[in-house]
C-alpha cells in the first residue's frame, strides 16, 4: 500500500470574526487505523483543537461523518471565530494504540481572522488653547486584524499632514490597536471647526470608520473690550458701555469698578451666537456725575473662562459737568486695553503691556 500522506490543501484561510472557518484535511490511505487530531501550533506547547476519538469540542465539528465507511476526509468546521482563534492548524494522523502514536502531520493551514477596528475615538487637549497655538488630538481604534490599516486626519474636510501614528503590537498578534496624534494650529475662526480621524481597513469594504472632535472643546477665543460713553443724560448721568466682543466659550464675568471699587458684577448667560460661533455682550453703567467731586475712573474688568482678568478703563471728567446743568458733557476715554486683542481679520495679536 502507498505510504499515508496527510493533505491540508490550503496554506492559509482568512475568515471574518463571527463567521465559521472550514479547515480541510484528507488522508491518502486507510492505513494505519487510528484517529485524527487537530492542533493549533506545533511542538510541545501545541493546543488540541479536535480529537476524533475523544473529548468535547463544542465549537468544532467534523465536516464529513467520521463514521462514514472508509472515511478519509477529516476536515473540521470551527464556528463563531474570534481573533483569538488565529494561528496555524495542523491535522495529525495517529496510529491506534495505548496511547495512540503520532504517524504524520499535515503541512498546516494558517487561519487569519479579519476583525473590524472599533469606532475611532478622538480626544482633544485637557485644557483650552488660544488662536495660533498648536493643540494635539489623539485618535484610537482597537481590536482589528490583519495589522494593515490606514489612518487619515482631516480638519473641516482638508487632510492634515502633521500627525504620528503607531500600530501595536509590532510583532504577531491576534488583534491590533492604532493610536495617532495630530497637531492642529488653532485660528479664531475654529469654534465651528471639526477634526476627523478616518480609519480604513480591509474588513470595512471601502467604507471607513470616522471619529470626530469639535475644536469648540479645545479653543478659547479671548474677547475684545471697548468702553465708550454714550450721550449725556439730562439728569447729570453719564451712560458708559463696555462692549465685549468675539469671545468663546460663553463663560464670562464682567465687573464694573468706580475708582477701583466694585460697582456691579454680572455673569454672561443665554447670549446669542455669532455666525462664527463666538459671542458678544454689552454692559452699561450709569454714572451720576453730580455725586462726584473729582473725575471718575471707570474700569470694565472681564474675566473670561477662568483666565486672568482683562481691564479697560475710562475716565469721566467731573469738572466738565456743572452741577446745575447737564447739557455740556465732556467725557474722556483715557483707558488703555491692558491687553490688546486682535484676530486674523484685524491683524492684531495679544500681548501684555
Amino acid at each position: 500500500e502507498e505510504e499515508l500522506q496527510v493533505i491540508q490543501p490550503e496554506k492559509s484561510v482568512s475568515v471574518a470574526a463571527g463567521d465559521s472557518a472550514t479547515l480541510n484535511c484528507t488522508v491518502t490511505s486507510l492505513i494505519p487505523v487510528g484517529p485524527i487530531q487537530w492542533f493549533r501550533g506545533a511542538g510541545p506547547g501545541r493546543e488540541l483543537i479536535y480529537h476524533q476519538k475523544e473529548g468535547h469540542f463544542p465549537r468544532v465539528t467534523s465536516v464529513s461523518e467520521s463514521t462514514k465507511r472508509n472515511n478519509m476526509d477529516f476536515s473540521i468546521h470551527i464556528s463563531n471565530i474570534t481573533p483569538a482563534d488565529a494561528g496555524t492548524y495542523y491535522c495529525v494522523k495517529f496510529r491506534k494504540g495505548s496511547p495512540d502514536v503520532e504517524v504524520k502531520s499535515g503541512a498546516g493551514t494558517e487561519l487569519s481572522v479579519r476583525a473590524k477596528p472599533s469606532a475611532p475615538v478622538v480626544s482633544g487637549p485637557a485644557v483650552r488653547a488660544t488662536a495660533e497655538h498648536t493643540v494635539s488630538f489623539t485618535c484610537e481604534s482597537h481590536g482589528f486584524s490583519p495589522r494593515d490599516i490606514t489612518l487619515k486626519w482631516f480638519k473641516n474636510g482638508n487632510e492634515l499632514s502633521d500627525f504620528q501614528t503607531n500600530v501595536d503590537p509590532a510583532g504577531k498578534s491576534v488583534s491590533y490597536s492604532i493610536r495617532s496624534t495630530a497637531r492642529v494650529v488653532l485660528t479664531r475662526r475654529d469654534v465651528h471647526s471639526q477634526v476627523i480621524c478616518e480609519v480604513a481597513h480591509v474588513t470595512l469594504q471601502g467604507d471607513p470608520l470616522r471619529g470626530t472632535a469639535n475644536l469648540s472643546e479645545a479653543i478659547r477665543v479671548p474677547p475684545f473690550l471697548e468702553v465708550t460713553q454714550q450721550s449725556m443724560r439730562a439728569d447729570n448721568q453719564v451712560n458708559v458701555t463696555c462692549q465685549v466682543t468675539k469671545f468663546y466659550p460663553q463663560r464670562l464675568q464682567l465687573t464694573w469698578l468706580e475708582n477701583g471699587n466694585v460697582s456691579r458684577t454680572e455673569m454672561a448667560s443665554a447670549l446669542p451666537e455669532n455666525k462664527d460661533g463666538t459671542y458678544n455682550w454689552t454692559s452699561w453703567l450709569l454714572v451720576n456725575v453730580s455725586a462726584h467731586r473729582d473725575d471718575v475712573k471707570l474700569t470694565c474688568q472681564v474675566e473670561h473662562d477662568g483666565q486672568p482678568a482683562v481691564n479697560k478703563s475710562f475716565s469721566v471728567k467731573v469738572s466738565a459737568h456743572p452741577k446745575e446743568q447737564g447739557s455740556n458733557t465732556a467725557a474722556e476715554n483715557t483707558g488703555t486695553n491692558e491687553r490688546d486683542y486682535k484676530d486674523d481679520d484685524d491683524k492684531h495679536h495679544h500681548h501684555h503691556h
Partner: antibody, heavy 119, light 110 residues
Framework: QVQLVQSGAEVKKPGASVKVSCKAS????????INWVRQAPGQGLEWIAM????????HYNQIFKDRATLTTDTSTSTAYMELRSLRSDDTAVYYC????????????WGRGTLVTVSS | DIVLTQSPDSLAVSLGERATINCRAS??????????IFWYQQKPGQPPKLLIY???NLDPGVPDRFSGSGSGTDFTLTISSLQAEDVAVYYC????????FGQGTKLEIK
C-alpha cells in the same frame, strides 16, 4: 482506554425478548460504529448488526432483520441490542464491538453477555 | 452474501514452527486498492481480538510473528514461529459488503 462493559447474563423462556446493553467509555461514543456479534456454545462468530450512534443508522444481517433492534443512548454512551421471539438456538454469548477505523471491522470487544433460552 | 471459507478447520503445529491458515472468499473482497479482510484470535472464555486489518496490517500490540497476505479472494494468516500462547481459534472476516466471518480454524500445539 477504550472499554465496552456489557450487562449481565440473562435466562429467558422461548418466545420472550432480551435486551443486552453495552456501555462505552474512553472515546467519543458518537464517532464510531458499534457491532453486535454472537457465538453459540462451541460455534463460530455470527455478525448480527451494526449501528452508528451519531445518527442511529443501522445495518442488519438479513437473518436477524425481523427480530433484532439496535438502539443507543448517547447521553449515557450506551448501545442496546434487543432480540425478540427467542428460540433455544438463540442461546449464545452476545458481544458488542467497536469499529475504530470505520472499516466495518471490530477493533475493541466487550466481554460478552450469555443469554440462555430454555423452557 | 460473500461467504468466507477457512482451511483447515483445525491445525496442529509444533512450537517454533510456522502455522498457516487460509481464508477464501466466494467473490473478491478488494475495493479501491484495499483488501477488506480482517483476522481475529479467540482464546477460550475470552472475546475475539483483532490481529490483522485490511489483509496485511498488524494491529498495534500484536507480535510481529503474525502476518497477513493475499488479495482478491485468497488470503493467508501466518504465524512464523508458534508460541504456546498462540493456541486459539482464528477467524477471518470480510467487510467488502456487510460483515461475515469464516467458520474458524482451531490451532493446537503438536
Amino acid at each position: 482506554q477504550v472499554q465496552l462493559v456489557q450487562s449481565g447474563a440473562e435466562v429467558k423462556k422461548p418466545g420472550a425478548s432480551v435486551k443486552v446493553s453495552c456501555k462505552a467509555s474512553g472515546y467519543t461514543f458518537t464517532n464510531y460504529w458499534i457491532n453486535w456479534v454472537r457465538q453459540a456454545p462451541g460455534q463460530g462468530l455470527e455478525w448480527i448488526a451494526m449501528i452508528d450512534p451519531s445518527d442511529s443508522e443501522t445495518h442488519y444481517n438479513q437473518i436477524f432483520k425481523d427480530r433484532a433492534t439496535l438502539t443507543t443512548d448517547t447521553s449515557t454512551s450506551t448501545a442496546y441490542m434487543e432480540l425478540r421471539s427467542l428460540r433455544s438456538d438463540d442461546t449464545a454469548v452476545y458481544y458488542c464491538a467497536m469499529d475504530y477505523g470505520s472499516l466495518y471491522a471490530m477493533d475493541y470487544w466487550g466481554r460478552g453477555t450469555l443469554v440462555t433460552v430454555s423452557s | 452474501d460473500i461467504v468466507l471459507t477457512q482451511s483447515p478447520d483445525s491445525l496442529a503445529v509444533s512450537l517454533g514452527e510456522r502455522a498457516t491458515i487460509n481464508c477464501r472468499a466466494s467473490k473478491s473482497v478488494s475495493s479501491s486498492g484495499y483488501n477488506y479482510i480482517f483476522w481475529y484470535q479467540q482464546k477460550p472464555g475470552q472475546p475475539p481480538k483483532l490481529l490483522i486489518y485490511l489483509a496485511s496490517n498488524l494491529d498495534p500490540g500484536v507480535p510481529d510473528r503474525f502476518s497477513g497476505s493475499g488479495s482478491g479472494t485468497d488470503f493467508t494468516l501466518t504465524i512464523s514461529s508458534l508460541q504456546a500462547e498462540d493456541v486459539a481459534v482464528y477467524y477471518c472476516q470480510h467487510s467488502r459488503e456487510l460483515p461475515t466471518f469464516g467458520q474458524g480454524t482451531k490451532l493446537e500445539i503438536k
